[in-house]
C-alpha cells in the first residue's frame, strides 16, 4: 500500500513539475528590466528563451521573436537546450511511468518489469529536472553577470552631458517557476526510484538446503519458488531472484549554478 | 467613433479643489489608459498624469503632492482632482489617450479653468 | 526630469518651402529593449488641440499627410515638411515618452510670410 502511494505520489509530483518545465521554457518573463534604482520608464521590458518583449505603459507590448539562430549566445542556446531536454526526457518518463504504475495492470506484466520500469522513470525524471535546475541556473548566472556588468556603467556618454539609460536586467517569474518545477521533477524521480525498491519482490538470503527423505534420494534446494507454507509473508507462489538481496544507490548529480541582449 | 469630452468647473478661487470629469465614448478604459495635460494661456504644453487600463496611476513628480486621478470603468469616466490650487494652475486642461510609443492619438476639446478670487 | 528643448522657437516660410526643425532631449529616449525611440511630435492649431503627428520618433499615425517625417535617434531629433502647406500653420510640440515625468518641447511655431 505503502509503495502504491509512493509511487502514485512521485508520478503525481513528477507530472506538476514537468507541466512547470514546459510552462517555465515557454514563458517570456526569464529576465525582467529592474525597476531598482532606475529611472522610472514609461516602457517595461522583458525577455524569454524565445522572444523579447516591451510593454508600454499605454498598456499595449509588442514582442519580437529571435528569428536567427546563429546570432543568439551560445549560453542561451544552452539553456534552450536543457530545458527541451528536460522537457522530452520528462515527457518520456512519464509515459514509462503510467505504465509502470501499480495501480494500473496491463495484461500479465511482472511486477519486476514494473519495478525496472518505475526505476526507469524515476531516473528520466531526476534528470529531467537536473536538466532544468541547470538550465535556470545557467541563465540565472548570466543574468547576474550582465547585471553588474551593466550596474558599473549605468549611464554612459559624453562627458556626462548626455545620459543614457542602460536597461539592466533581473530575475523573472519565469526562473522562480523553473527552479521551483526542476525540484518537484527530482524530488518526484526519487519518490519513483524509492517505490521501485518496494515493488521489486523480496529476495531469500538463506543457503540452499538439502533434505534427505528416507526411501528416496531427491535433493529440494530453494531458489526457484517459494513455498506456500514457508518462508516470507507471501502466500502466492513468486519467481525469486537469486543472490542476495539487491540495493538501489541512485547516482545523483547536483546542478552547477544568463541576460543576454 | 473616439470622443473624449472634458468638464469642470470652469472659475475656482485661490486655495480651493478642482474636479475635472474626462467622459469618454468609443472604446474602453479597460483597454486604453488615459493622460492629462494642461496648458496655460499662451504658453506650452505640460504633463499632468496618467491612469492606464488597470488603475495604476503616475504623476508629473512636481504635482504628485496636491494631485489625483482615479476612474470609473463602468461610467467611461476619468476624474482629475487637484487641491491647493493657485492662479498658475489656470489653464485648459486636456484628456487623452494612449496608444503606440505612449503617444496620445485622440484627445478631448479640453476645459478652461480659471483660478481667481 | 529630461528636459527637451525645441529650435528654432519659431519659423516664417512661404507656401512650398521645405521645413526643419529640431528636438533635443537631455536624455536617450532609446529603449534598448525594442530599439525604438520614444519620441512623439504634435501639431497644435489655434484655438484646438493638439494632434498626433508623429510616434516612435519615425513613425507617422494614420491619416497624417506624407510630407511629414520625423527622424533621429537617442537625443536628436527632427520632424522635417517637405512642402509647407496653408493648414500646416501651427506650433509643433515634441514629447519625451520614455522617461518620467513625460516632459514636452516648448515648441516651434510656423508662420507664413
Known amino acids: 500500500m505503502a509503495v502504491t502511494a509512493c509511487q502514485g505520489l512521485g508520478f503525481v509530483v513528477s507530472l506538476i513539475g514537468i507541466a512547470g518545465i514546459i510552462a517555465a521554457t515557454c514563458m517570456d518573463q526569464w529576465s525582467t528590466q529592474d525597476l531598482y534604482n532606475n529611472p522610472v520608464t514609461a516602457v517595461f521590458n522583458y525577455q524569454g528563451l524565445w522572444r523579447s518583449c516591451v510593454r508600454e505603459s499605454s498598456g499595449f507590448t509588442e514582442c519580437r521573436g529571435y528569428f536567427t539562430l546563429l546570432g543568439l549566445p551560445a549560453m542561451l542556446q544552452a539553456v534552450r537546450a536543457l530545458m527541451i531536454v528536460g522537457i522530452v526526457l520528462g515527457a518520456i518518463g512519464l509515459l514509462v511511468s503510467i505504465f509502470a504504475l501499480k495501480c494500473i495492470r496491463i495484461g500479465s506484466m511482472e511486477d519486476s518489469a514494473k519495478a525496472n520500469m518505475t526505476l526507469t522513470s524515476g531516473i528520466m525524471f531526476i534528470v529531467s529536472g537536473l536538466c532544468a535546475i541547470a538550465g535556470v541556473s545557467v541563465f540565472a548566472n548570466m543574468l547576474v553577470t550582465n547585471f553588474w556588468m551593466s550596474t558599473a556603467n549605468m549611464y554612459t556618454g559624453m562627458g556626462g552631458m548626455v545620459q543614457t539609460v542602460q536597461t539592466r536586467y533581473t530575475f523573472g517569474a519565469a526562473l522562480f517557476v523553473g527552479w521551483v518545477a526542476g525540484g518537484l521533477t527530482l524530488i518526484g524521480g526519487v519518490m519513483m526510484c524509492i517505490a521501485c525498491r518496494g515493488l521489486a519482490p523480496e529476495e531469500t538470503n538463506y543457503k540452499a538446503v538439502s533434505y534427505h527423505a528416507s526411501g528416496h534420494s531427491v535433493a529440494y534446494k530453494p531458489g526457484g519458488f517459494k513455498a506456500s507454507t514457508g518462508f516470507g509473508s507471501n502466500t502466492k507462489n513468486k519467481k525469486i531472484y537469486d543472490g542476495g538481496a539487491r540495493t538501489e544507490d541512485e547516482v545523483q548529480s547536483y546542478p552547477s549554478k544568463h541576460d543576454y541582449v | 467613433q473616439v470622443q473624449l469630452k472634458e468638464s469642470g468647473p470652469g472659475l475656482v478661487a485661490p486655495s480651493q479643489s478642482l474636479s475635472i470629469t474626462c467622459t469618454v465614448s468609443?472604446?474602453?478604459?479597460?483597454?486604453?489608459?488615459i493622460s492629462w495635460v494642461r496648458q496655460p494661456p499662451g504658453k506650452g504644453l505640460e504633463w499632468l498624469g496618467e491612469i492606464w487600463t488597470g488603475g495604476g496611476t503616475n504623476y508629473n513628480s512636481a504635482l504628485k503632492s496636491r494631485l489625483s486621478i482615479s476612474k470609473d470603468n463602468s461610467k467611461s469616466q476619468v476624474f482629475l482632482k487637484m487641491n491647493s490650487l493657485q492662479t498658475d494652475d489656470t489653464a485648459r486642461y486636456y484628456c487623452?489617450?494612449?496608444?503606440?510609443?505612449?503617444?496620445?492619438?485622440?484627445w478631448g476639446q479640453g476645459t478652461t479653468l480659471t483660478v481667481s478670487s | 526630469d529630461i528636459v527637451m528643448t525645441q529650435s528654432p522657437s519659431s519659423l516664417t516660410v512661404t507656401a512650398g518651402e521645405k521645413v526643419t526643425m529640431s528636438c533635443k532631449s537631455s536624455?536617450?529616449?532609446?529603449?534598448?529593449?525594442?530599439?525604438?525611440?520614444?519620441l512623439t511630435w504634435y501639431q497644435q492649431k489655434p484655438g484646438q488641440p493638439p494632434k498626433l503627428l508623429i510616434y516612435w520618433a519615425s513613425t507617422r499615425e494614420s491619416g497624417v499627410p506624407d510630407r511629414f517625417t520625423g527622424s533621429g535617434s537617442g537625443t536628436d531629433f527632427t520632424l522635417t515638411v517637405s512642402s509647407v502647406q496653408a493648414e500646416d500653420l501651427a506650433v509643433y510640440y515634441c514629447q519625451n515618452n520614455f522617461i518620467y515625468p513625460l516632459t514636452f518641447g516648448p515648441g516651434t511655431k510656423l508662420e507664413l510670410k
Open positions: 468609443g472604446f474602453s478604459l479597460t483597454s486604453y489608459a
Open positions: 536624455q536617450s529616449l532609446l529603449n534598448s529593449g525594442n530599439q525604438k525611440n520614444y
Open positions: 487623452g489617450r494612449l496608444s503606440y510609443g505612449n503617444s496620445l492619438d485622440y
